[in-house]
């Protein structure tokens, strides 16, 4: 991600006088890096903070994990703490629901809830007052072309992902879709090989748009391929936050 | 991008004659007599701020870990008129990165970063304040199915944008993986050409969702394919965005 | 819509539901247009309909969004493609589908692409196919700045409230 | 006109299963989720689950669980509950009805008797 | 589970009356409460969706009421058509759960 350093920040330093220039440079720049953090470190000293220290780390999300060195971490910060009470907003992660269904974790991970918002599978999500939110989802979908080759159009599956409002505040009456994506997918076969099924292939189908929700009304996704949900971890979630 | 410094906004400082030697004596009295108020005014003006310190890392999520030393962005390089000072907000778009990488432009056409959002291609976005924040990224790819025909299989490509968390508050270990994207392509070849690449072909791969963030903690975009990344204008971007 | 089997608006088989005249003291400027799906052959926004709205200062002109007053803004905007495969005998040449949204503004002289997807399909290979982009993000935007859309592949849309919308909303 | 038609009262053995169907007509199938209630006699209703025509998906009230089995037909508009193992207890009305929470069309219910 | 009760399991009233019929919760359902009529011959109607929103069809004779954990059910002037079985249902949390049911009756 390119070598950013002092070289790059600071300019080439061609000194081509007199060894005086050198030392005078060089007291200039002792000067500066003395008398700066000495400074830094007495007005730190006298006045009240929440300063994180120096961070060095080394990170490769990669395929080996690698250590983290040296992080601090501040005895008062607490990951789980909700970090803005007065906002009603959702982030809601897929989890897989027993008989190969879509159901959503609200505490895992990055899940959470906060001001009043309610979720379960069943009930879908329930904002706490009236407004407008802004509504997301993406649905990472995984599959295989089935064994047997053939025509390609018998292997071509089109992916819905759509959150619908229905239920509670809104009434008995048709759920109302919201807003959708969709994406068709032909998997691909190798010609010679006419059993086995093909690579896996992926894709995401993902959304997001303004909607005028009330309170108790309720808002769910809908899919049209539960069993070709992609789990893995950031692939699919779905979420609210009011804006206005 | 590359190193982006005093070099590029600065000029070089080349000192070639006695008179600079004269110069850079005085330029060391003047250097305390400025340097010590200067930074006390900007300690005081950051700690109330929570402002992090410095952040040295070794950050890469591709094979090579490359390192990025010291990189500071100070308060008084806003790109532009800020428009609303009072929200962390980013907008970074995607530029060519020496060696076939990734990275991001802050200023340049509709990039910009807002109070005391802080971001280098080595260590990611920092935000300013712990809050709610709505992540996004959209990663355009292009590519061409590449010459000689054969297997669909070996011409398929899983193209995957992801977005980390890490650093700060967040803590040691692996970075923590956030919104995930992802496309298969398997490009087509005309059967009657059997040499030369095939067609074009284009796709996005995005992303957005909420999460809650601390201070100190860091973004950072990962991607599958850089050599494939589209950098036409509106094409590839990420940022962020404080709700609450 | 026959052939790919997505469901019209549930708003359109049953009650429209009631718009909201939201009673926050600090109402943000926002926007959500949705595809007007009476022009079969372009893509004109309607504001008027549906769950489409503009709420504080925000005007639809020219098929544009105007900004009412400067700041961040979030703009998003999704298309939906379909179409029928080809007979196996019809060569099929690739589809070219895109959608851009554009800023127009006092500081360019021309438009500017800020949100971009594009996507080549082979309908040859498929049976009837469904194809959606969406995008979104953050910009510093200026008062009287125009949003407008650009799109390749318009007779391909799939023209509901659900699937074709662009909006706006300040944060 | 939405109308939901139950099949007719079935006599069944202690263990065995028995299917009963829900015939939706009026409306679009995969447009609302069914759900299954039973009502044994001179008591109140109990809620047994709910599936999703258009995808499939059920939820189960885990009394229920091991009991009942939701399914739907897509092609012939029909949702189906078996109920497995029978006993005397799960001698009952059974009702289908149309809703995402609040039920706005009931069938007419289906008697289902649990006897040697 | 949350359980509903229905603390009067029958009632009678003379045609014309103004009569309630209440519900209780186990714990707070958020407004998410509905009522059914279930007419002697099984029939089952619904009514009032969401504590007070009456479902199309049904006479504005019927109201509803409540919050938090108490809920009632208003028919006003009562008719001959109103002899039924009067049941609350909670959609606030799974599984859904009835009331035990009352029984109007015309005196």
């Known amino acids: 991600m390119g070598a950013l350093g002092l070289e790059g920040r600071g300019g080439r330093l061609q000194g081509r006088g007199s060894l005086l220039l050198a030392v005078a440079g060089a007291t200039s720049l002792v000067t500066l890096l003395l008398a700066v953090p000495i400074t830094v470190l007495a007005v730190l000293a006298l006045v009240p903070q929440d300063q994180g220290g120096l961070v060095t780390e080394t990170a490769d999300p990669g395929a080996q994990a690698q250590q983290g060195l040296g992080f601090q971490k501040l005895p008062e910060e607490e990951p789980e703490t909700d970090l803005s009470p007065g906002l009603p907003a959702a982030h809601l992660i897929g989890a897989p629901l027993k008989g190969q269904g879509l159901g959503w974790e609200t505490t895992k991970e990055q899940a959470f809830l906060t001001s009043g918002t309610q979720f379960s599978d069943a009930e879908g999500l329930a904002l706490p007052q009236d407004g407008l939110y802004y509504l997301y989802c993406l649905v990472g979908y995984r599959g295989r072309a089935p064994p047997g080759g053939g025509d390609p159009q018998g292997r071509s599956v089109t992916l819905r992902s759509s959150l619908y409002r229905a239920g509670g505040a809104y009434g008995p009456g048709t759920p109302e879709l919201l807003l959708e994506g969709a994406e068709t997918v032909t998997p691909v076969l190798d010609p010679a090989r006419r059993q086995g099924y093909g690579p896996l292939w992926y894709t995401s189908v993902g959304f997001g748009g303004l909607v005028q929700l009330r309170r108790g009304e309720r808002v769910y996704v809908n899919i049209s391929h539960p069993d070709m949900v992609d789990f893995a971890r950031g692939k699919t979630f779905f979420g609210a936050v009011m804006v206005g | 991008m590359g190193a982006l410094g005093l070099e590029g906004r600065g000029g070089r400082l080349q000192g070639r004659g006695s008179l600079l030697l004269a110069v850079a004596g005085a330029t060391s009295l003047v250097t305390l007599l400025l340097a010590v108020p200067i930074t006390v005014l900007a300690v005081l003006a950051l700690v109330p701020q929570d402002q992090g310190g410095l952040v040295t890392e070794t950050a890469d999520p591709g094979a090579q870990a490359q390192q990025g030393l010291g990189f500071q962005k100070l308060p008084e390089e806003e790109p532009e008129t800020d428009l609303s000072p009072g929200l962390p907000a980013a907008h970074l778009i995607g530029a060519p990165l020496k060696g076939q990488g990734l990275g991001w432009e802050t200023t340049k056409e509709q990039a910009f970063l807002t109070s005391g959002t802080q971001f280098s291609d080595a260590e990611g976005l920092a935000l300013p304040q712990d809050g709610l924040y709505y992540l996004y990224c959209l990663v355009g790819y292009r590519g061409r199915a590449p010459p000689g025909g054969g297997d669909p299989q070996g011409r398929s490509v899983t193209l995957r944008s992801s977005l980390y968390r890490a650093g700060g508050a967040y803590g040691p270990g692996t970075p923590e993986l956030l919104l995930e994207g992802a496309e298969t392509v398997t490009p087509v070849l005309d059967p009657a050409r059997r040499q030369g690449y095939g067609p074009l072909w284009y796709t996005s791969v995005g992303f957005g969702g909420l999460v809650q963030l601390r201070r100190g903690e860091r973004v950072y975009v990962n991607i599958s394919h850089p050599d494939m990344v589209d950098f036409a204008r509106g094409k590839t971007f990420f940022g962020a965005v404080m709700v609450g | 819509l026959p052939g790919v089997g997505l469901t019209p608006s549930a708003a359109q088989t049953a009650r429209q539901h009631p718009k909201m005249h939201l009673a926050h003291s600090t109402l943000k400027p926002a926007a959500h247009l949705i595809g007007d799906p009476s022009k079969q052959n372009s893509l004109l926004w309607r504001a008027n309909t549906d769950r489409a709205f503009l709420q504080d200062g925000f005007s639809l002109s020219n098929n544009s969004l105007l900004v009412p007053t400067s700041g961040i803004y979030f703009v998003y905007s999704q298309v939906v493609f379909s179409g029928k495969a080809y007979s196996p005998k019809a060569t099929s040449s690739p589809l070219y589908l895109a959608h851009e949204v554009q800023l127009f503004s006092s500081q360019y002289p021309f438009h500017v692409p800020l949100l971009s997807s594009q996507k080549m399909v082979y309908p040859g290979l498929q049976e009837p196919w469904l194809h959606s982009m969406y995008h979104g993000a953050a910009f510093q935007l200026t008062q009287g700045d125009q949003l407008s859309t650009h799109t390749d592949g318009i007779p391909h849309l799939v023209l509901s409230p659900s699937t074709v919308f662009f909006g706006a909303f300040a944060l | 006109e939405v109308q939901l038609q139950q099949s007719g009262p079935e006599l069944v053995k202690p263990g065995a299963s028995v299917k009963i169907s829900c015939k939706a007509s009026?409306?679009?199938?995969?447009?609302?989720?069914m759900n299954w209630m039973r009502q044994s006699h001179g008591k109140s209703l109990e809620w047994i689950g709910r599936?999703?025509?258009?995808?499939?998906?059920?939820f189960y009230n885990q009394k229920f669980k091991d009991k009942a089995t939701l399914t739907v037909d897509k092609s012939s508009t029909t949702a189906h509950m078996e109920l497995l193992s029978l006993t005397s207890e799960d001698s009952a009305v059974y009702y289908c009805?149309?809703?995402?929470?609040?039920?706005?069309?009931w069938g007419q219910g289906t008697s289902v008797t649990v006897s040697s | 589970d949350i359980q509903m009760t229905q603390t009067t399991s029958s009632l009678s009233a003379s045609l014309g009356d103004r009569v309630t019929i209440s519900c209780r919760a186990s714990?707070?359902?958020?407004?998410?409460l509905t009522w059914y009529q279930q007419k002697p011959d099984g029939t089952v109607k619904l009514l009032i969706y969401?504590?007070?929103k009456l479902h199309s069809g049904v006479p504005s004779r019927f109201s509803g009421s409540g919050s938090g954990t108490d809920y009632s059910l208003t028919i006003s002037n009562l008719e001959p058509g109103d002899i039924a079985t009067y049941y609350c249902?909670?959609?606030?949390?799974?599984?859904?759960?009835f009331g035990g049911g009352a029984k109007l009756e015309i005196k």
């Open positions: 009805g149309r809703g995402y929470d609040a039920m706005d069309y």
């Open positions: 009026g409306y679009s199938f995969t447009g609302y989720f």
């Open positions: 599936i999703n025509p258009y995808n499939g998906d059920s």
């Open positions: 714990q707070d359902i958020s407004n998410f």
């Open positions: 969401y504590t007070s």
């Open positions: 249902q909670q959609v606030s949390k799974f599984p859904w759960t």
